[in-house]
């Protein structure tokens, strides 16, 4: 799915009002120094692509995130604010149902959610000019950004 045409401000609002708090709840009891963010994103559509992948795709050692509260709210936000997103997710929903057997919080899942928090931070506040084309429509060329 191409996230370019999503309403980023509405998704950001949904994240800050509820999803962020659910992620914090999931991570509660985990030391803030425990995980190093290794997944990054370069613009808002890219951030949403990475967020979708980490939230809904089962990975080795963490198969169960898709049924967590933050994941369901993420799915709802994307369905509402990304045109045509719901239609692309029918097959993914079937895969999710198959993964619904056990709800276990593993260290790998905690690490994955830590990565998600980092991706959401960059979605909320893109840093560089190359992130601007779809994010900052009206004054992007007034920004002077430096990339090292």
């Amino acid at each position: 799915y191409d996230f370019t045409n999503c309403d980023f401000e509405k998704i950001k609002a949904a994240y800050l009002s509820t999803i962020s708090k659910d992620l914090i709840t999931y991570m509660s009891g985990t030391k803030s120094t425990e995980f190093n963010n290794t997944v990054s994103c370069s613009n808002r559509p890219h951030c949403l692509t990475e967020i979708q992948s980490l939230t809904f795709n089962p990975t080795a050692g963490c198969a169960s995130l898709a049924k967590e509260m933050f994941a369901m709210k993420t799915k709802a936000a994307l369905a509402i604010w990304c045109p045509g997103y719901s239609e692309t997710q029918i097959n993914a929903t079937q895969a999710m149902k198959k993964a619904r057997k056990s709800k276990v919080t593993t260290n790998k899942c905690l690490e994955q959610v830590s990565q998600l928090q980092g991706l959401w931070r960059r979605f909320n506040r893109p840093l560089l000019k190359q992130q601007g084309s779809s994010d900052y429509k009206d004054d992007d060329d007034k920004h002077h950004h430096h990339h090292h």
Partner: antibody, heavy 119, light 107 residues
Framework: EVQLVQSGAEVKKPGSSVKVSCKAS????????IEWVRQAPGQGLEWMGV????????NYNENFKGRVTITADKSTSTAYMELSSLRSEDTAVYYC????????????WGQGTTVTVSS | DIVMTQSPDSLAVSLGERATINCKAS??????VTWYQQKPGQSPKLLIY???NHYTGVPDRFSGSGSGTDFTLTISSLQAEDVAVYYC?????????FGQGTKLEIK
């Protein structure tokens, strides 16, 4: 508990440079943006720039006309702000701050470093 | 640059009374507004992020509202420890900019 500890006060001559350090502890340094903000005596807050220590991407306030350079050393969890071509108007308290968990605010601040520019 | 203009510059309110500080942006900043409190000789402290969200440990008497260009910080019942300078900040566009500050005192 996250802590940002800054280097000590500096007195500098006009035209010289100053480099202020900001050492982070209690969190994963490379996961959060580090901001630099200054405050002239009796004045408000002025944002200078930001660095992502994870990939050293930066963004500067162009009002400083290229005089600001922000760097980070992951091995020591330390960010640096260097300001060149100093003038008397640069006399201020310089703060480093860390972005919060949502990326929408600065939740931890250093204690501030006083830089005095005087001939 | 987006200019953030606070009003009033200073405000004197009686203990237990309501204090209201306004912040106006020169162009829309959506909901990307943060409020900070700074006491004399101290670093700023985060109070409210994304217009109305309380930072951890901030008392309920502080609240934020607004969207677009007009924002308000309200202290419902002023306490002695609330004497400080309050700043709004936008993070919608680079460079990030702050209001000039509002000094809150006890009447």
């Amino acid at each position: 508990e996250v802590q940002l500890v800054q280097s000590g006060a500096e007195v500098k001559k006009p035209g010289s440079s100053v480099k202020v350090s900001c050492k982070a502890s209690g969190g994963t340094f490379s996961n959060y943006l580090i901001e630099w903000v200054r405050q002239a005596p009796g004045q408000g807050l002025e944002w200078m720039g930001v660095i992502d220590p994870g990939n050293v991407d930066t963004n500067y306030n162009e009002n400083f006309k290229g005089r600001v350079t922000i760097t980070a050393d992951k091995s020591t969890s330390t960010a640096y702000m260097e300001l060149s071509s100093l003038r008397s108007e640069d006399t201020a308290v310089y703060y480093c701050a860390r972005e919060d968990n949502t990326g929408t605010a600065f939740d931890y601040w250093g204690q501030g470093t006083t830089v005095t520019v005087s001939s | 640059d987006i200019v953030m203009t606070q009003s009033p510059d200073s405000l004197a309110v009686s203990l237990g009374e309501r204090a209201t500080i306004n912040c106006k942006a020169s162009q829309s900043v959506s909901s990307d507004v943060t409020w900070y409190q700074q006491k004399p000789g101290q670093s700023p402290k985060l109070l409210i992020y994304y217009v109305s969200n309380h930072y951890t440990g901030v008392p309920d008497r502080f609240s934020g509202s607004g969207s677009g260009t007009d924002f308000t910080l309200t202290i419902s019942s002023l306490q002695a420890e609330d004497v400080a300078v309050y700043y709004c900040q936008q993070h919608h566009r680079f460079p990030l900019t702050f209001g000039q500050g509002t000094k809150l005192e006890i009447k």
